[in-house]
Protein backbone atom coordinates (compact mmCIF):
# COMPACT_ATOMS: atom_id res chain seq x y z
CA UNK A 1 0.00 0.00 0.00
CA UNK A 2 1.20 3.56 -0.64
CA UNK A 3 2.37 5.33 2.52
CA UNK A 4 -0.55 7.76 2.55
CA UNK A 5 -3.08 4.96 3.07
CA UNK A 6 -0.83 2.67 5.15
CA UNK A 7 -2.09 1.27 8.42
CA UNK A 8 0.07 1.71 11.52
CA UNK A 9 2.63 0.53 12.17
CA UNK A 10 4.38 1.17 8.88
CA UNK A 11 7.85 2.15 7.75
CA UNK A 12 7.97 5.70 6.40
CA UNK A 13 9.47 6.34 3.00
CA UNK A 14 13.12 7.46 3.12
CA UNK A 15 13.20 11.12 4.17
CA UNK A 16 9.46 11.02 4.81
CA UNK A 17 7.60 11.83 8.02
CA UNK A 18 4.76 10.21 9.87
CA UNK A 19 1.23 11.49 9.47
CA UNK A 20 -0.86 13.59 11.83
CA UNK A 21 -1.53 11.80 15.16
CA UNK A 22 1.36 9.44 14.50
CA UNK A 23 4.90 9.40 15.83
CA UNK A 24 8.10 7.76 14.74
CA UNK A 25 9.16 5.06 17.16
CA UNK A 26 12.97 4.90 17.21
CA UNK A 27 13.07 1.35 18.53
CA UNK A 28 10.61 -0.16 16.07
CA UNK A 29 11.66 2.30 13.33
CA UNK A 30 8.01 2.57 12.38
CA UNK A 31 5.27 5.17 12.23
CA UNK A 32 2.90 4.34 15.07
CA UNK A 33 -0.36 5.76 16.42
CA UNK A 34 -0.37 8.39 19.13
CA UNK A 35 -2.87 8.08 21.98
CA UNK A 36 -5.74 10.58 22.17
CA UNK A 37 -6.16 13.15 24.99
CA UNK A 38 -7.23 11.40 28.18
CA UNK A 39 -5.12 8.33 27.36
CA UNK A 40 -1.46 7.31 27.43
CA UNK A 41 0.69 4.61 25.83
CA UNK A 42 0.32 1.44 27.86
CA UNK A 43 2.35 -0.64 25.38
CA UNK A 44 4.62 0.87 22.74
CA UNK A 45 4.39 -0.32 19.17
CA UNK A 46 6.60 -2.93 17.56
CA UNK A 47 7.23 -3.73 13.89
CA UNK A 48 4.07 -5.81 13.89
CA UNK A 49 1.74 -4.28 16.51
CA UNK A 50 0.49 -0.74 17.02
CA UNK A 51 0.57 1.35 20.20
CA UNK A 52 -1.81 0.13 22.91
CA UNK A 53 -3.46 3.05 24.69
CA UNK A 54 -5.12 3.13 28.10
CA UNK A 55 -7.20 5.71 29.96
CA UNK A 56 -5.54 8.05 32.44
CA UNK A 57 -6.04 7.17 36.08
CA UNK A 58 -7.86 9.45 38.52
CA UNK A 59 -6.11 12.79 39.17
CA UNK A 60 -3.99 12.40 36.03
CA UNK A 61 -4.45 13.76 32.52
CA UNK A 62 -3.10 14.15 29.02
CA UNK A 63 -4.24 17.18 27.08
CA UNK A 64 -2.70 16.37 23.69
CA UNK A 65 -2.27 13.42 21.36
CA UNK A 66 0.72 11.69 22.89
CA UNK A 67 2.81 8.58 23.42
CA UNK A 68 3.78 9.17 27.06
CA UNK A 69 4.07 6.08 29.24
CA UNK A 70 2.24 7.77 32.14
CA UNK A 71 -0.33 10.53 32.32
CA UNK A 72 0.61 13.82 33.98
CA UNK A 73 -0.48 14.47 37.55
CA UNK A 74 -3.06 17.19 38.04
CA UNK A 75 -1.94 20.17 40.12
CA UNK A 76 -2.64 20.29 43.83
CA UNK A 77 -6.01 21.47 45.10
CA UNK A 78 -6.66 25.19 44.89
CA UNK A 79 -5.70 27.17 47.98
CA UNK A 80 -8.25 29.06 50.07
CA UNK A 81 -7.66 32.35 48.22
CA UNK A 82 -8.38 30.71 44.88
CA UNK A 83 -11.28 29.10 43.06
CA UNK A 84 -11.14 26.15 40.70
CA UNK A 85 -12.10 27.46 37.27
CA UNK A 86 -11.26 24.21 35.49
CA UNK A 87 -11.56 20.84 37.19
CA UNK A 88 -9.03 18.07 36.85
CA UNK A 89 -10.29 15.62 34.24
CA UNK A 90 -8.58 12.92 32.19
CA UNK A 91 -8.10 15.49 29.43
CA UNK A 92 -7.18 18.66 31.31
CA UNK A 93 -5.32 19.87 34.33
CA UNK A 94 -6.97 21.72 37.19
CA UNK A 95 -6.79 25.51 36.81
CA UNK A 96 -6.94 27.74 39.89
CA UNK A 97 -7.62 31.45 39.60
CA UNK A 98 -7.79 34.13 42.25
CA UNK A 99 -11.17 34.67 43.80
CA UNK A 100 -13.10 37.98 43.60
CA UNK A 101 -11.33 40.79 45.43
CA UNK A 102 -7.94 39.20 44.75
CA UNK A 103 -5.58 39.30 41.77
CA UNK A 104 -2.77 37.13 40.45
CA UNK A 105 0.52 38.65 41.60
CA UNK A 106 2.66 35.86 40.17
CA UNK A 107 1.40 33.69 37.35
CA UNK A 108 2.49 30.25 36.20
CA UNK A 109 1.94 28.46 32.91
CA UNK A 110 -1.66 27.67 33.75
CA UNK A 111 -3.43 29.49 36.53
CA UNK A 112 -1.78 31.45 39.32
CA UNK A 113 1.18 30.84 41.61
CA UNK A 114 0.47 33.69 44.04
CA UNK A 115 -2.77 35.55 44.72
CA UNK A 116 -2.87 38.82 46.65
CA UNK A 117 -5.76 40.87 47.91
CA UNK A 118 -6.61 43.94 45.86
CA UNK A 119 -5.35 47.16 47.38
CA UNK A 120 -7.96 49.23 49.17
CA UNK A 121 -7.52 52.97 48.67
CA UNK A 122 -7.79 54.80 51.99
CA UNK A 123 -9.86 57.96 52.55
CA UNK A 124 -8.41 60.82 50.53
CA UNK A 125 -7.41 58.42 47.76
CA UNK A 126 -9.55 57.01 44.98
CA UNK A 127 -9.10 54.27 42.43
CA UNK A 128 -7.12 55.53 39.42
CA UNK A 129 -6.92 52.17 37.70
CA UNK A 130 -9.17 49.26 38.66
CA UNK A 131 -7.77 45.88 39.54
CA UNK A 132 -7.93 43.07 37.03
CA UNK A 133 -7.37 39.34 37.35
CA UNK A 134 -3.64 39.97 36.91
CA UNK A 135 -3.01 43.50 38.22
CA UNK A 136 -3.56 45.37 41.46
CA UNK A 137 -5.62 48.50 41.97
CA UNK A 138 -3.75 51.80 41.49
CA UNK A 139 -4.78 54.55 43.92
CA UNK A 140 -4.38 58.30 43.47
CA UNK A 141 -4.84 61.24 45.81
CA UNK A 142 -8.17 62.97 45.27
CA UNK A 143 -7.64 66.19 43.34
CA UNK A 144 -9.00 69.51 44.63
CA UNK A 145 -12.78 69.55 44.33
CA UNK A 146 -13.07 65.78 44.74
CA UNK A 147 -13.08 63.39 47.71
CA UNK A 148 -13.25 59.82 48.85
CA UNK A 149 -14.29 59.00 52.41
CA UNK A 150 -14.08 55.22 52.08
CA UNK A 151 -11.47 52.48 52.27
CA UNK A 152 -12.23 50.64 49.06
CA UNK A 153 -10.74 48.82 46.09
CA UNK A 154 -13.49 50.16 43.82
CA UNK A 155 -14.43 53.71 44.89
CA UNK A 156 -13.17 56.61 42.79
CA UNK A 157 -12.76 60.22 43.89
CA UNK A 158 -16.13 61.93 43.65
CA UNK A 159 -16.82 65.63 43.14
CA UNK A 160 -17.79 67.71 46.16
CA UNK A 161 -21.37 68.82 46.29
CA UNK A 162 -21.85 72.48 45.48
CA UNK A 163 -23.54 74.38 48.28
CA UNK A 164 -25.56 77.57 48.12
CA UNK A 165 -24.08 78.21 51.56
CA UNK A 166 -21.13 76.11 52.72
CA UNK A 167 -21.19 74.98 56.34
CA UNK A 168 -17.94 73.00 56.13
CA UNK A 169 -15.76 73.06 53.01
CA UNK A 170 -14.93 69.70 51.48
CA UNK A 171 -11.44 68.30 51.26
CA UNK A 172 -9.84 65.17 49.81
CA UNK A 173 -11.38 62.87 52.40
CA UNK A 174 -14.66 64.63 53.13
CA UNK A 175 -17.55 66.00 51.11
CA UNK A 176 -18.61 69.60 51.55
CA UNK A 177 -21.35 70.14 54.13
CA UNK A 178 -24.08 72.52 53.08
CA UNK A 179 -26.37 74.65 55.18
CA UNK A 180 -29.00 74.88 52.43
CA UNK A 181 -31.37 72.01 51.72
CA UNK A 182 -30.71 71.31 48.05
CA UNK A 183 -27.03 70.91 47.22
CA UNK A 184 -25.91 70.08 43.72
CA UNK A 185 -22.88 68.25 42.42
CA UNK A 186 -20.11 70.14 40.69
CA UNK A 187 -20.40 67.60 37.88
CA UNK A 188 -22.20 64.35 37.27
CA UNK A 189 -20.70 62.02 39.85
CA UNK A 190 -20.58 59.09 37.46
CA UNK A 191 -20.26 55.58 38.74
CA UNK A 192 -18.92 55.57 42.25
CA UNK A 193 -17.88 51.94 41.92
CA UNK A 194 -15.44 50.63 39.40
CA UNK A 195 -16.13 47.04 38.41
CA UNK A 196 -14.38 44.20 40.13
CA UNK A 197 -12.01 42.23 37.91
CA UNK A 198 -13.71 40.40 35.06
CA UNK A 199 -14.61 36.93 36.17
CA UNK A 200 -16.67 33.98 35.08
CA UNK A 201 -18.04 33.77 38.60
CA UNK A 202 -20.79 35.84 40.17
CA UNK A 203 -19.43 38.78 42.10
CA UNK A 204 -19.77 39.02 45.84
CA UNK A 205 -18.91 41.71 48.32
CA UNK A 206 -15.18 42.14 48.76
CA UNK A 207 -13.96 39.35 51.01
CA UNK A 208 -11.41 40.06 53.71
CA UNK A 209 -10.36 36.59 54.77
CA UNK A 210 -7.23 35.79 56.63
CA UNK A 211 -4.77 35.01 53.86
CA UNK A 212 -3.56 31.48 53.44
CA UNK A 213 0.02 30.57 52.82
CA UNK A 214 1.43 27.43 51.31
CA UNK A 215 4.50 25.86 52.90
CA UNK A 216 7.65 27.53 51.69
CA UNK A 217 5.91 30.79 50.80
CA UNK A 218 7.19 33.81 52.69
CA UNK A 219 4.33 35.56 54.41
CA UNK A 220 5.22 38.75 56.18
CA UNK A 221 2.72 40.60 58.28
CA UNK A 222 3.83 44.16 57.63
CA UNK A 223 3.70 47.04 60.01
CA UNK A 224 0.38 48.67 60.55
CA UNK A 225 -2.46 48.57 58.09
CA UNK A 226 -1.18 45.43 56.42
CA UNK A 227 -0.27 46.05 52.83
CA UNK A 228 -0.71 43.06 50.58
CA UNK A 229 -2.55 40.11 52.01
CA UNK A 230 -1.29 37.24 49.95
CA UNK A 231 -1.74 33.54 49.53
CA UNK A 232 -0.33 30.94 47.22
CA UNK A 233 -0.85 27.59 45.72
CA UNK A 234 1.66 24.85 46.18
CA UNK A 235 3.38 23.95 42.92
Amino acid sequence: LPAQVAFTPYAPEPGGTCRLREYYDQTAQMCCSKCPPGQHAKVFCTKTSDTVCDSCEDSTYTQLWNWVPECLSCGSRCSSDQVETQACTREQNRICTCRPGWYCALSKQEGCRLCAQLRKCRPGFGVARPGTETSDVVCKPCAPGTFSNTTSSTDICRPHQICHVVAIPGNASMDAVCTSTSPTRSMAPGAVHLPQPVSTRSQHTQPTPAPSTAPGTSFLLPVGPSPPAEGSTGD
Epitope: A105, L106, A116, S218, P222
Partner: antibody, heavy 121, light 107 residues
Protein backbone atom coordinates in the same frame (compact mmCIF):
# COMPACT_ATOMS: atom_id res chain seq x y z
CA UNK B 1 13.58 38.16 57.39
CA UNK B 2 13.09 40.96 54.87
CA UNK B 3 16.31 41.82 53.06
CA UNK B 4 17.09 44.40 50.36
CA UNK B 5 20.59 44.37 48.90
CA UNK B 6 21.67 47.13 46.54
CA UNK B 7 24.55 46.82 44.08
CA UNK B 8 25.96 48.60 41.04
CA UNK B 9 27.15 51.87 42.59
CA UNK B 10 30.51 53.38 41.76
CA UNK B 11 32.40 56.33 40.34
CA UNK B 12 31.16 57.71 37.04
CA UNK B 13 31.92 60.81 35.00
CA UNK B 14 29.32 63.53 34.43
CA UNK B 15 27.10 62.56 31.51
CA UNK B 16 27.77 58.87 32.13
CA UNK B 17 25.42 56.03 33.01
CA UNK B 18 25.08 53.53 35.82
CA UNK B 19 22.66 50.69 36.56
CA UNK B 20 21.68 49.90 40.12
CA UNK B 21 20.11 46.61 41.21
CA UNK B 22 18.33 45.59 44.39
CA UNK B 23 17.97 41.90 45.24
CA UNK B 24 15.04 41.29 47.57
CA UNK B 25 14.23 38.31 49.78
CA UNK B 26 12.09 37.37 52.75
CA UNK B 27 8.74 38.62 51.42
CA UNK B 28 6.35 38.14 48.51
CA UNK B 29 8.18 40.55 46.21
CA UNK B 30 5.54 40.68 43.47
CA UNK B 31 2.89 42.03 45.86
CA UNK B 32 4.84 45.05 47.14
CA UNK B 33 5.47 48.51 45.71
CA UNK B 34 9.11 49.63 45.82
CA UNK B 35 11.09 52.86 45.63
CA UNK B 36 14.58 54.29 45.39
CA UNK B 37 15.58 56.97 47.89
CA UNK B 38 18.94 58.75 47.96
CA UNK B 39 20.88 60.54 50.65
CA UNK B 40 23.21 63.34 49.67
CA UNK B 41 26.64 63.87 51.24
CA UNK B 42 24.93 66.62 53.27
CA UNK B 43 22.59 63.93 54.71
CA UNK B 44 19.43 65.20 53.04
CA UNK B 45 17.02 62.44 52.01
CA UNK B 46 15.35 62.60 48.62
CA UNK B 47 12.78 60.20 47.19
CA UNK B 48 13.87 59.35 43.63
CA UNK B 49 11.49 56.89 41.99
CA UNK B 50 8.60 54.51 42.68
CA UNK B 51 7.18 51.44 40.94
CA UNK B 52 4.01 49.61 41.88
CA UNK B 53 3.86 45.86 42.50
CA UNK B 54 2.97 44.93 38.92
CA UNK B 55 5.34 47.43 37.30
CA UNK B 56 2.41 49.24 35.66
CA UNK B 57 2.69 52.52 37.53
CA UNK B 58 5.92 54.54 37.98
CA UNK B 59 6.59 57.97 39.46
CA UNK B 60 9.78 60.04 39.48
CA UNK B 61 11.04 63.12 41.27
CA UNK B 62 11.40 66.09 38.92
CA UNK B 63 15.17 66.10 39.45
CA UNK B 64 15.60 62.71 37.74
CA UNK B 65 12.61 62.54 35.37
CA UNK B 66 13.71 61.67 31.84
CA UNK B 67 17.17 60.54 33.01
CA UNK B 68 16.39 57.67 35.40
CA UNK B 69 14.22 54.61 34.79
CA UNK B 70 12.87 52.33 37.50
CA UNK B 71 11.96 48.75 36.54
CA UNK B 72 11.47 45.42 38.27
CA UNK B 73 11.61 41.73 37.47
CA UNK B 74 9.12 39.89 39.67
CA UNK B 75 10.40 36.50 38.51
CA UNK B 76 13.89 37.41 39.75
CA UNK B 77 12.81 39.38 42.86
CA UNK B 78 14.92 42.29 41.65
CA UNK B 79 14.42 46.05 41.42
CA UNK B 80 16.49 48.19 39.03
CA UNK B 81 17.38 51.84 38.54
CA UNK B 82 18.91 52.81 35.20
CA UNK B 83 20.63 56.16 35.53
CA UNK B 84 21.83 58.17 32.53
CA UNK B 85 23.05 61.73 31.87
CA UNK B 86 24.41 61.74 35.40
CA UNK B 87 25.20 65.05 37.09
CA UNK B 88 27.41 65.88 40.06
CA UNK B 89 24.26 66.54 42.11
CA UNK B 90 23.28 62.86 41.67
CA UNK B 91 26.18 61.95 43.96
CA UNK B 92 24.56 60.17 46.90
CA UNK B 93 23.97 56.94 48.76
CA UNK B 94 21.11 55.17 46.94
CA UNK B 95 18.72 53.08 49.02
CA UNK B 96 16.31 50.45 47.78
CA UNK B 97 13.18 50.68 49.95
CA UNK B 98 9.98 48.73 50.30
CA UNK B 99 6.90 50.90 49.96
CA UNK B 100 4.87 52.89 49.96
CA UNK B 101 1.91 50.58 49.34
CA UNK B 102 0.60 53.78 47.82
CA UNK B 103 -2.88 54.90 48.66
CA UNK B 104 -3.24 52.19 51.27
CA UNK B 105 -0.17 51.94 53.52
CA UNK B 106 1.93 55.03 52.99
CA UNK B 107 5.40 54.51 54.42
CA UNK B 108 8.80 52.95 53.73
CA UNK B 109 9.00 50.00 56.10
CA UNK B 110 12.30 48.39 55.03
CA UNK B 111 15.49 49.97 53.70
CA UNK B 112 18.54 48.35 52.14
CA UNK B 113 22.08 49.17 53.26
CA UNK B 114 22.59 51.47 50.26
CA UNK B 115 25.07 51.71 47.40
CA UNK B 116 27.23 54.77 46.79
CA UNK B 117 27.11 56.66 43.49
CA UNK B 118 29.79 59.29 42.90
CA UNK B 119 29.56 61.51 39.83
CA UNK B 120 32.86 63.31 39.32
CA UNK B 121 35.39 64.06 36.60
CA UNK C 1 6.05 70.41 45.60
CA UNK C 2 5.02 70.10 49.23
CA UNK C 3 7.69 71.56 51.49
CA UNK C 4 8.33 69.83 54.80
CA UNK C 5 9.91 72.25 57.26
CA UNK C 6 11.46 70.38 60.15
CA UNK C 7 12.65 71.96 63.40
CA UNK C 8 14.89 72.18 65.23
CA UNK C 9 17.81 71.27 62.96
CA UNK C 10 19.76 69.97 65.94
CA UNK C 11 19.61 69.78 69.69
CA UNK C 12 21.67 68.39 72.53
CA UNK C 13 19.93 66.76 75.49
CA UNK C 14 20.57 64.57 78.51
CA UNK C 15 19.37 61.00 78.90
CA UNK C 16 15.98 61.05 80.63
CA UNK C 17 14.83 64.33 79.11
CA UNK C 18 11.81 64.71 76.83
CA UNK C 19 12.02 66.12 73.32
CA UNK C 20 9.51 67.18 70.66
CA UNK C 21 10.49 67.50 67.00
CA UNK C 22 8.09 69.21 64.61
CA UNK C 23 7.43 69.13 60.89
CA UNK C 24 5.21 71.61 59.12
CA UNK C 25 3.75 70.75 55.71
CA UNK C 26 3.26 73.59 53.24
CA UNK C 27 -0.22 72.21 52.49
CA UNK C 28 -2.67 69.61 53.77
CA UNK C 29 -1.17 66.11 53.65
CA UNK C 30 -4.12 64.37 55.34
CA UNK C 31 -2.05 62.53 57.98
CA UNK C 32 0.03 60.82 55.28
CA UNK C 33 3.22 61.34 57.24
CA UNK C 34 5.98 59.05 58.47
CA UNK C 35 8.87 59.56 60.89
CA UNK C 36 12.22 57.77 60.55
CA UNK C 37 15.26 57.44 62.78
CA UNK C 38 18.76 57.14 61.32
CA UNK C 39 21.85 56.29 63.30
CA UNK C 40 25.37 57.07 62.14
CA UNK C 41 26.42 54.79 59.26
CA UNK C 42 23.05 52.99 59.18
CA UNK C 43 19.92 53.09 57.01
CA UNK C 44 16.83 54.97 58.21
CA UNK C 45 14.23 52.98 60.15
CA UNK C 46 10.49 53.54 60.29
CA UNK C 47 9.23 54.83 63.65
CA UNK C 48 5.76 56.27 63.01
CA UNK C 49 3.33 56.16 60.07
CA UNK C 50 -0.06 57.78 59.40
CA UNK C 51 1.20 60.60 61.66
CA UNK C 52 0.34 58.84 64.93
CA UNK C 53 0.77 55.06 64.57
CA UNK C 54 3.85 53.37 66.00
CA UNK C 55 5.67 50.92 63.73
CA UNK C 56 6.15 47.40 64.97
CA UNK C 57 8.78 47.09 67.70
CA UNK C 58 9.05 50.84 68.39
CA UNK C 59 9.09 51.63 72.14
CA UNK C 60 6.03 53.39 73.59
CA UNK C 61 8.13 56.37 74.70
CA UNK C 62 7.82 57.51 71.05
CA UNK C 63 4.56 59.14 69.98
CA UNK C 64 3.30 61.07 66.98
CA UNK C 65 0.68 63.81 66.90
CA UNK C 66 -0.80 66.28 64.46
CA UNK C 67 -2.51 69.64 64.50
CA UNK C 68 -3.58 70.96 61.12
CA UNK C 69 -0.49 70.85 58.93
CA UNK C 70 1.91 70.61 61.87
CA UNK C 71 3.13 67.17 62.84
CA UNK C 72 5.16 66.30 65.93
CA UNK C 73 7.29 63.44 67.17
CA UNK C 74 7.69 63.28 70.94
CA UNK C 75 10.24 61.13 72.76
CA UNK C 76 9.69 60.76 76.49
CA UNK C 77 12.58 59.93 78.82
CA UNK C 78 15.34 59.81 76.21
CA UNK C 79 17.50 56.70 76.17
CA UNK C 80 21.08 56.53 74.88
CA UNK C 81 19.90 54.50 71.85
CA UNK C 82 17.53 57.30 70.81
CA UNK C 83 20.30 59.63 69.73
CA UNK C 84 20.64 60.02 65.99
CA UNK C 85 18.92 61.94 63.19
CA UNK C 86 15.15 62.04 62.74
CA UNK C 87 13.34 62.73 59.47
CA UNK C 88 9.71 63.31 58.61
CA UNK C 89 8.28 62.48 55.18
CA UNK C 90 4.89 63.04 53.55
CA UNK C 91 3.10 60.60 51.25
CA UNK C 92 0.44 62.82 49.74
CA UNK C 93 1.05 63.88 46.13
CA UNK C 94 4.42 63.16 44.53
CA UNK C 95 7.20 64.08 45.04
CA UNK C 96 7.21 62.55 48.50
CA UNK C 97 9.52 65.02 50.20
CA UNK C 98 11.44 64.65 53.47
CA UNK C 99 12.09 67.20 56.14
CA UNK C 100 15.67 68.44 56.50
CA UNK C 101 16.29 66.26 59.54
CA UNK C 102 16.82 66.85 63.26
CA UNK C 103 20.12 65.74 64.72
CA UNK C 104 19.64 64.68 68.33
CA UNK C 105 22.90 64.55 70.27
CA UNK C 106 23.70 63.35 73.76
CA UNK C 107 24.90 65.93 76.31
Amino acid sequence: EVQLQESGGGLVQPGGSLNLSCAASGFAFSTYDLSWVRQTPGKRLEWVAYINNGGISTYYSDTVKGRFTITRDNAKNTLYLQMSSLKSEDTAMYYCVRGPFYGSANYFDYWGQGTTVTVSS
Amino acid sequence: DILMTQSPASLSLFVGETVTITCRASENIYSNLAWYQQKQGKSPQLLVYDATKLAEGVPSRFSGSESGTQYSLKINSLQSEDFGTYYCQHFWVTPWTFGGGTKLEIK
